[in-house]
């Protein structure tokens, strides 16, 4: 069961896996959740008797999922969120005052303030956390010095009380890094650099995901099952280098190499290994053996067994045992199989319990039918219809769900809108006719318009709606991923514009959500078509040379959604254009990637 509550002055006895240092109990709980085996923890607060144990976070495991409770002053105990259904994030924007988080200092430089120091850490490949000496620090020579730090585990090796310094963590896991995101996997390539760890993996994609959530892995080499040396088959070597890039590439068949997706992990699944591996057996410590009907049932069983990390399903040989087989639930110290065997007929895979550690926007949506302009239920689950109720209720604009309390839309939608009270947001809608008096909607608490917005044509045509209540995600109502800063060089080829807007310039709002596949254009190309306008880097253009497919009145604020590596990204917001679907007049969209900092600043504000 899911226990969120923390137990003050309680120590969980026994079950110790390892001890790390965290600035508070809440952070200790997150560290426990992301650790492959931790189910419970005890954190030693400053009020504990032994000052040498302050800030220690003791990660624990138990076969019974519980441990004896002992009274102890200053101890705070609790359970990991592994048992909980809600989405998780490793993002920690807190700044810890008067704490020196210790690790390996590898860079010391002067910065204006702690925020700049945190940015420096976020944009440095090696940095896990930082300590900044404020301008009130007693040692004058050390004032304003920003120390970037890393450790083998990503957590501090110690924490000291120290007045007039502040510490904090890298915001890479908050999607705030400017570092490049290199998604290519290079076949027949070995990176010859420092191995920091090695794990067993079934393929290069799982190897890459493991590299992504390893604190120090910057790139990897994976040896496939065809690799000549048997002891290296299915071996995933996690690597780093001082420069952050591989120093040497060696051409070797049956090896694949690639990079950590740390800098784009919010828009790509890195914890969720959902595939099945056929004719493959995963070896590890056996947790349980159960009879089930099929490998999918075996995966479900592993997902519901809290300590299960991976499984192998073996179908029964007896013909009378139709469809039944044996499900071997397994675990290991690092969450990966200890060995992988092929040719034995097993079907293996991983628990799906870790999928909630990925951004919900990365989960696959229902397969779509290509062609046709009317959308299908659940095809664009991030699309919302924004209504105004004054003077009468009508569709005003489109919008996109980007968080459980946030809609991203266009600023120009709010011309003449005096108050958020007259707005209603409807999610999970296909036909406008579904909206009746009693249809559930979200009230709008706040309209946040970019403060540089003047007109759609001059740019900054972007706005956020903060909902009055949080949204529960369903198959027909869930978020779209924002693009990654690190993805700025990606060429999107599968882009769609959606909305209930006019189908021609003089028309009316459509009942059914319409969709159109539209190619993106370069800004140079676009400038040629709009010579009397300034097409800025904050805009992106899409459309056919011959016209015919475009967004139109009523589509404003809606998404330009592009699919890349099986994940949909909100690349643009429908903004403006000359006419609709005119020849040589592409549609102009707000270029979302250029406004990521603004979006994150507004949505992650305390």
């Amino acid at each position: 069961e899911c226990v969120i509550k923390l137990f003050s002055d309680i120590y969980f006895q026994g079950g110790d896996i390892t001890t790390v240092y965290t600035p508070n109990a809440k952070h200790c709980q997150v560290v426990c959740t992301y650790h492959p085996r931790c189910l419970l923890f005890t954190f030693m607060a400053e009020s504990s008797v032994d000052s040498t144990k302050w800030f220690s976070c003791i990660l624990k495991d138990s076969v019974t999922e519980s441990l004896p409770k002992v009274n102890m002053t200053g101890a705070i105990s609790g359970y990991s969120f592994k048992q909980c259904p809600h989405q998780l994030s490793a993002c920690n924007k807190d700044i810890y005052v008067d704490l020196d988080m210790q690790g390996m200092n590898y860079n010391g430089s002067v910065t204006k303030n702690a925020q700049e120091c945190q940015e420096r850490c976020t944009n440095d490949a090696h940095c896990h956390f930082f300590t900044y000496a404020t301008r009130q620090f007693p040692s004058a020579e050390h004032r304003n010095i920003c120390l970037l730090k890393y450790t083998q585990t990503g957590a501090p090796t110690g924490i000291r009380k120290l007045k007039k310094v502040v510490s904090g963590f890298s915001l890479k896991s908050c999607a705030l890094s400017n570092l490049a995101c290199i998604r290519d996997i290079f076949p027949s390539t070995v990176f010859a650099d420092n191995n920091i760890d090695s794990v067993v993996a079934p393929d290069a994609l799982v190897c890459r995901r493991i590299c992504t959530h390893h604190p120090n892995c910057l790139f990897f080499t994976f040896f496939s099952q065809e690799w000549p040396k048997e002891s290296h088959r299915n071996l995933c070597l996690l690597k780093t280098s001082e420069s952050g890039l591989p120093s040497t590439r060696i051409h070797k068949n049956q090896a694949l190499s690639g990079f950590s997706l740390q800098n784009c992990r919010h828009s790509i699944p890195v914890f969720c290994h959902s595939s099945f591996y056929y004719d493959t057996d995963f070896l590890g410590e056996e947790l349980d053996i159960v009879d089930v009907k099929g490998h999918e049932a075996c995966q479900k069983m592993c997902t519901s067994a809290i300590r299960c990390q991976f499984f192998t399903y073996s179908s029964s040989q007896e013909s009378h045992n139709k469809g039944k087989g044996t499900c071997y639930l397994k675990l290991s110290s690092n969450g990966s199989p200890t060995k992988i065997l092929h040719g034995r007929g097993g079907i293996s895979g991983y628990t799906l319990r870790l999928c909630k550690m990925d951004n919900v926007c990365t989960t696959k949506i229902k397969p779509r039918i290509v062609g046709g302009s009317a959308s299908l239920p659940g095809e664009w689950p991030w699309q919302v219809t924004l209504h105004t109720v004054s003077p009468t209720q009508r569709h005003l604009c489109g919008g996109s769900i980007i968080g459980n309390q946030w809609i991203l839309t266009a600023a120009h939608c709010f011309y003449g809108i005096e108050s958020p009270k007259i707005l209603r947001v409807y999610g999970g809608i296909l036909n406008q006719s579904e909206i009746k008096e009693d249809t559930a909607f979200f009230g709008v608490q706040e309209i946040i318009i970019h403060d540089q917005y003047k007109t759609a044509e001059s740019g900054y045509d972007i706005a956020l709606l903060k909902l009055e209540t949080t949204m529960n995600y369903t198959d027909s109502q869930r978020p779209i991923c924002l693009p990654s800063k690190g993805d700025r060089n990606v060429i999107y080829t599968d882009c769609w514009v959606t909305g209930w807007g006019y189908r021609k310039l003089r028309d009316k709002i459509q009942n059914t959500l319409q969709k159109a596949k539209i190619p993106l254009l370069s800004n140079e190309e676009c400038r040629k078509r709009y010579q009397r306008h300034e097409i800025t880097s904050g805009m992106i253009c899409a459309g056919y040379k011959e016209g015919g497919k475009d967004a139109c009145k009523g589509d404003s604020g809606g998404p330009l959604s592009c699919k890349h590596n099986e994940v949909w990204h909100l690349v643009g917001i429908t903004s403006w254009g000359e006419g609709c679907a005119q020849r040589e007049r592409p549609g102009i969209y707000t270029n979302v990637v250029k406004y990521l900092d603004w979006i994150l600043e507004k949505t992650q504000a305390p």
Epitope: M104, N105, Y106, N107, G108, F137, P138, S139, A140
Partner: antibody
Framework: QVQLEESGPGLVAPSQSLSITCTVS????????IYWVRQPPGKGLEWLGM???????DYNSALKSRLSISKDNSKSQVFLKMNSLQTDDTARYYC??????????WGQGTTLTVSS | DIVMTQSHKFMSTSVGDRVSITCKAS??????VAWYQQKPGQSPKLLIY???YRNTGVPDRFTGSGSGTDFTFTISSVQAEDLAVYYC?????????FGGGTKLERL
């Protein structure tokens, strides 16, 4: 673990130059300042100078004209050079790591004798 | 440059005594003062930094106090292994400087 080790010539003639190397392990010179401190026989500690993580240097005012501190981050080595040595430069020379101006780790020191 | 003065070159004490060593700075050094212990034939060892912060592994009988120009280092109950030379050092502004040292000896 953190270690610092000084190595020097041991004996130098007056008016000659001195070069001492401090080799460190367990941490990176790009993230820590390194100090040089000396101690004449039976006397107290004297602060000579330091090199910061970013390569900036600071020196003892009285010795500034004779001192030079440099480093090689890739080799994890810090160098102390001192010229025009006199007999009163005879001392044990230590390198130490910076922790906000204090010195949290010290080498064992190397003894220098200035004598003809 | 800042001069640090330890007025007592020697201090006599017995096991179990409370002893305080003082150090005076020639100008305001805020709270940027460290204290070191040095035993014969050994390198100095950091005990206290920034006036009152104990270094890792230093017993809590060692404490420091003061600010501005006047600083005190105290051993609440002297142990035999505490007999050594103690140095103060300002780490407020470079060039950093040490006091002359105070030798703690058996009475």
């Amino acid at each position: 673990q953190v270690q610092l080790e000084e190595s020097g010539p041991g004996l130098v003639a007056p008016s000659q130059s001195l070069s001492i190397t401090c080799t460190v392990s367990g941490f990176s010179l790009t993230g820590y300042g390194i100090y040089w401190v000396r101690q004449p026989p039976g006397k107290g500690l004297e602060w000579l100078g330091m090199i910061w993580g970013d390569g900036r240097t600071d020196y003892n005012s009285a010795l500034k004209s004779r001192l030079s501190i440099s480093k090689d981050n890739s080799k994890s080595q810090v160098f102390l050079k001192m010229n025009s040595l006199q007999t009163d430069d005879t001392a044990r020379y230590y390198c130490a790591r910076d922790y906000y101006g204090s010195k949290d780790y010290w080498g064992q020191g190397t003894t220098l004798t200035v004598s003809s | 440059d800042i001069v640090m003065t330890q007025s007592h070159k020697f201090m006599s004490t017995s096991v179990g005594d409370r002893v305080s060593i003082t150090c005076k700075a020639s100008q305001d050094v805020s709270t940027a003062v460290a204290w070191y212990q040095q035993k014969p034939g050994q390198s100095p060892k950091l005990l206290i930094y920034l006036t009152s912060y104990r270094n890792t592994g230093v017993p809590d009988r060692f404490t420091g106090s003061g600010s501005g120009t006047d600083f005190t280092f105290t051993i609440s109950s002297v142990q035999a292994e505490d007999l050594a030379v103690y140095y103060c050092q300002q780490h407020y502004k470079t060039p950093y400087s040490f006091g002359g040292g105070t030798k703690l000896e058996r009475l």
